[in-house]
Structure formats: structure tokens, C-alpha cells
């Protein structure tokens, strides 16, 4: 009775519950051949896995996760455009990241991720656990990315400070390179928070989409020598 | 590429006033330092000053200070640099310079890209 | 203001030859371990080119036959091989401090 294809961990238990609610459920159905399991059954076995992988996603507070998200990625956008305003205003060089104005396209990512991570949060469907898992394996690589940026741009940037001290600190050089400098690490620290959040958003939604089994269940009746091979539809689009 | 445009040669009394133009192209005008340097025949050079006309600020040695007067005009990326009260010392070649600066672990600062030079010949 | 001082006045080299110019600073060109040392060549009637920067740095398009050493306040410029279309003036150049100083050039001729 007990042999089935494992997808998850040993204490992932929720699909062992459910193989176990299949084999009380196994019943000969007339006609059918013996120890076939009714296949109207299977979409209960489903439904239950998925009951379970739901409650995983959800144990990982998408939806208040999503919200912060989106903070976060709003305030790291004004201090992008802040950073701009300053920095072309000031008419100098700037740090590495306003250049580059990940700030802008970042945050642009991380906003649609706290949306999706939102919704999934609220109808937790395959297809938005899905896209919302995927958004933060990226979200989670751009802050990487973003951290790497802020820490060479802040470095470099700080020695400016040397070229505003040969002209006698211009149009208060000094000032202008503190401030950007601030800001550079403002969106450094939160760059650290969106890497922090999006890889825990996508740990959730991987327990829930990566532990789905996929593979053939093999269910082997107690009444019968022949064991039959049924495999597992893809779950419902609930 | 940075190229630096200078206007043609001036003939002036002395006593007379000059403006020399220096048209930047290829960079970001208003992010670098323009220098004004000064060369007489078969001599060394001389700073005289310079101007960053994003903000406006100017820096002058002493000897060009009430000689010299450097502004810029940010519409048309053209800096210029007036010389008052000519006297016949004041017979050179003078050249504008974009000073490029690189910044990092280490730092450097220097006269990167060159204008062609405006001769200036006081006569009576 | 820091005097820089050039030597020799002129000099004649072989061609295939070493060529070195001298610069030194009446102070330390050296800042946040750095040597604010930059060098220039000028050919008549044209404006001078940057050779070298930070005392050992080639410009850009510098042919690798220059070279620059040098740190505190003695500095030299070196060309070697030495080819015909090196004839020309040779100035060395401190950014330590505004204002930026100029030697006072050395005359680079085939011998």
C-alpha cells in the first residue's frame, strides 16, 4: 500500500496526508478492474494537497510582506528621484547609482512584486503563487545586484570629497556629495530589506509550487497482484 | 569626441578690452571645470583661472585677478574670458582646457582635452 | 604657490634612445597617496597634450614609449625609444593645489 513518488522533504507531511486519505478512499469500482482507484476520487486528493501547500504559502504572510514591499520600494524610488533632483542640480558627478538609476527600475520590479505577493496572498491560485514566486527570485537577484551597485557607488563616490577640497569646496561640494552620499546609503539599506523580504517571499512560494508532486503515484491495492500506475493530473487552476 | 572651439585671433590697442569664446562639444558642459591658460611666444605656461559653469563659481591667480574675467553660458555650452585693460605683456596664445577628474582610491585631476589656443597680439 | 622646476633647459637624444626630462616641486605634489605630477607635450603652434597623469599614468592614446615615475617632489618623464616625431616641448604639471603650477618646459631634440 504504501508506495508513492516523494516530491517534498521528509517533513513536508502534507503529502503524506494525502496518500493516506488515498488509501482509504481506494475502492474497486464495479467493472472497472480490481484496485483501481475511482478516478473522481483523485480530484479530492488534489484539492486536499493543495488545501495544505495553501496554508504553507500563506504561513509566510504574503500579503502583509507585499504591502512592505511596496513601501519600501516607494521610498527607495523618492530617494532616487531626490538623489537625481541633487545630483544634476548640483552639476558634478554623481554616485555609480545615479547613473545606473536602478532606483527607478527597481523599484519598478519590486513594486509589481509586492502586488503580486499581494494578490496571491489574497486569491491563492497556482498561477499567482506561480508569477509571484518568480517575481521575487528576480526581485531577490536585482537587490543582489542593487547591494553590490550602492556599496562600490558609496566607496568610489566618497572620495570626492578630495575634488570639492581642491577648489575650496564650490557651491558647498562638501554638502551636496554628504548628502547624495546619505541617500546612496539609504537605498543601500533598503536594497538589504527587499533582498530580505523577496527571498523569504520566494521560500514560501517555493515550499507551496516546488513541493506540488508531479511524478507517478503508484498504488499498489492489497487485493490484488497487479499494481497499477496512476499518475497525478496537474493540480486544478483553483 | 570632447573637442574644444576657440575663436579666431584679436589684433587690440592697448588699454583695450577682449572676449575670447571657447565652444565645448561632446561632454556635459555643465559638469567640468573649464581652465584658462595663458602662453607667451616661446614661454612656459600660465594658469590663469578657471570656471565651472554649472554653478557658476571661478577660481583666479592672483596675478589675472581684476585682469581677467571668466563667465559661461550654459545655452550655447561656451565659455569665455575677458581680458580688460590690454598692455603689450599681455601679447600670448590663449587656451581653454577641460579638467577631467577621476575619482576613486586614488584620485586624479587633469587637463584632459585642449582648444586650439586664440592668439592675442596688443599693438599700437 | 609651488615652483616646479624643469631640467635640463633642452636636451638632444639619439634616436632609439633614452630621453629623460626632470621635475621637481618646491613641496610634496603627494595627496591621499597620490602624486598630483602631470605631464604635457607640446609641438609648435599646436596646444599642448596630455602624456602622463598622477605622476605614472599613460593618457589615453599615449604611445607606451612614455613613461612616468616619480613621487614627493621629484618626478621624471621618460621616452624611450626615442623617435623623430618626439621633437617637441615637454612640461610637467602640478594639480596638488589651486593654483595648478607649470615647469617651465624642456626642448627635446634629435641628436
Known amino acids: 500500500h504504501q508506495t508513492y513518488r516523494r516530491h517534498c522533504r521528509p517533513e513536508e507531511s502534507t503529502f503524506s496526508a494525502a496518500m493516506t486519505t488515498m488509501q482509504g478512499m481506494e475502492q474497486a469500482t464495479p467493472g472497472a478492474g480490481p484496485g483501481v482507484p475511482q478516478l473522481g476520487n483523485m480530484a479530492v486528493v488534489h484539492s486536499h494537497l493543495w488545501k495544505g501547500l495553501q496554508e504553507k504559502f500563506l504561513k509566510g504572510e504574503p500579503k502583509v510582506l507585499g504591502v512592505v514591499q511596496i513601501l519600501i520600494a516607494l521610498m527607495s524610488l523618492s530617494m532616487g528621484i531626490t538623489m537625481m533632483c541633487v545630483a544634476f542640480s548640483a552639476y558634478g558627478h554623481y554616485p555609480i547609482s545615479v547613473y545606473i538609476g536602478y532606483t527607478i527600475w527597481g523599484s519598478v520590479m519590486f513594486i509589481i512584486s509586492g502586488s503580486l505577493s499581494i494578490a496571491a496572498g489574497i486569491r491563492t491560485t497556482k498561477g499567482l503563487v506561480r508569477g509571484s514566486l518568480g517575481m521575487n527570485i528576480t526581485s531577490s537577484v536585482l537587490a543582489v545586484s542593487a547591494i553590490l551597485i550602492n556599496t562600490i557607488s558609496l566607496t568610489i563616490y566618497s572620495f570626492y570629497h578630495r575634488y570639492c577640497n581642491y577648489y575650496g569646496n564650490p557651491n558647498n561640494c562638501h554638502g551636496t556629495v554628504s548628502i547624495l552620499m546619505g541617500m546612496d546609503g539609504m537605498v543601500l539599506l533598503l536594497s538589504v530589506l527587499e533582498f530580505c523580504i523577496a527571498v523569504s517571499l520566494s521560500a514560501f512560494g517555493c515550499k507551496a509550487i516546488c513541493c506540488t508532486p508531479g511524478g507517478v503515484v503508484l498504488i499498489i491495492p492489497s487485493n490484488s497482484h497487479m499494481a497499477e500506475a496512476a499518475p497525478l493530473t496537474p493540480l486544478n487552476e483553483v | 569626441q570632447v573637442q574644444l572651439q576657440q575663436s579666431g585671433a584679436e589684433l587690440a590697442r592697448p588699454g583695450a578690452s577682449v572676449k575670447l569664446s571657447c565652444k565645448a562639444s561632446?561632454?556635459?558642459?555643465?559638469?567640468?571645470?573649464m581652465q584658462w591658460v595663458k602662453q607667451r611666444p616661446g614661454q612656459g605656461l600660465e594658469w590663469i583661472g578657471a570656471?565651472?559653469?554649472?554653478?557658476?563659481?571661478?577660481r583666479y591667480t592672483q596675478k589675472f585677478k581684476g585682469k581677467a574675467t571668466l563667465s559661461a553660458d550654459k545655452s550655447s555650452s561656451t565659455a569665455y574670458m575677458q581680458l580688460s585693460n590690454l598692455a603689450s605683456e599681455d601679447s600670448a596664445v590663449y587656451y581653454c582646457?577641460?579638467?577631467?577628474?577621476?575619482?576613486?582610491?586614488?584620485?586624479?585631476?587633469?587637463?584632459?582635452?585642449w582648444g586650439a589656443g586664440t592668439t592675442v597680439t596688443v599693438s599700437s | 604657490d609651488i615652483v616646479l622646476t624643469q631640467s635640463p633647459a633642452s636636451l638632444a637624444v639619439s634616436l632609439g634612445q633614452r630621453a629623460t626630462i626632470s621635475c621637481r616641486a618646491s613641496?610634496?605634489?603627494?595627496?591621499?597617496?597620490?602624486?598630483?605630477m602631470n605631464w604635457f607635450q607640446q609641438k609648435p603652434g599646436q596646444p599642448p597634450k596630455l602624456l602622463i597623469y598622477?605622476?605614472?599614468n599613460q593618457g589615453s592614446g599615449v604611445p607606451a614609449r612614455f613613461s612616468g615615475s616619480g613621487s614627493g617632489t621629484d618626478f621624471s618623464l621618460n621616452i624611450h625609444p626615442m623617435e623623430e616625431d618626439d621633437t617637441a616641448m615637454y612640461f610637467c604639471?602640478?594639480?596638488?593645489?589651486?593654483?595648478?603650477?607649470f615647469g617651465g618646459g624642456t626642448k627635446l631634440e634629435i641628436k
Open positions: 598622477g605622476a605614472s
Open positions: 613641496e610634496s605634489v603627494d595627496n591621499y597617496g597620490v602624486s598630483f
Open positions: 604639471q602640478q594639480s596638488k593645489e589651486v593654483p595648478p603650477t
Open positions: 570656471t565651472h559653469p554649472g554653478h557658476g563659481d571661478t
Open positions: 582646457a577641460r579638467e577631467e577628474v577621476y575619482y576613486g582610491f586614488r584620485s586624479y585631476w587633469y587637463f584632459d582635452v
Open positions: 561632446g561632454y556635459t558642459f555643465t559638469n567640468y571645470w
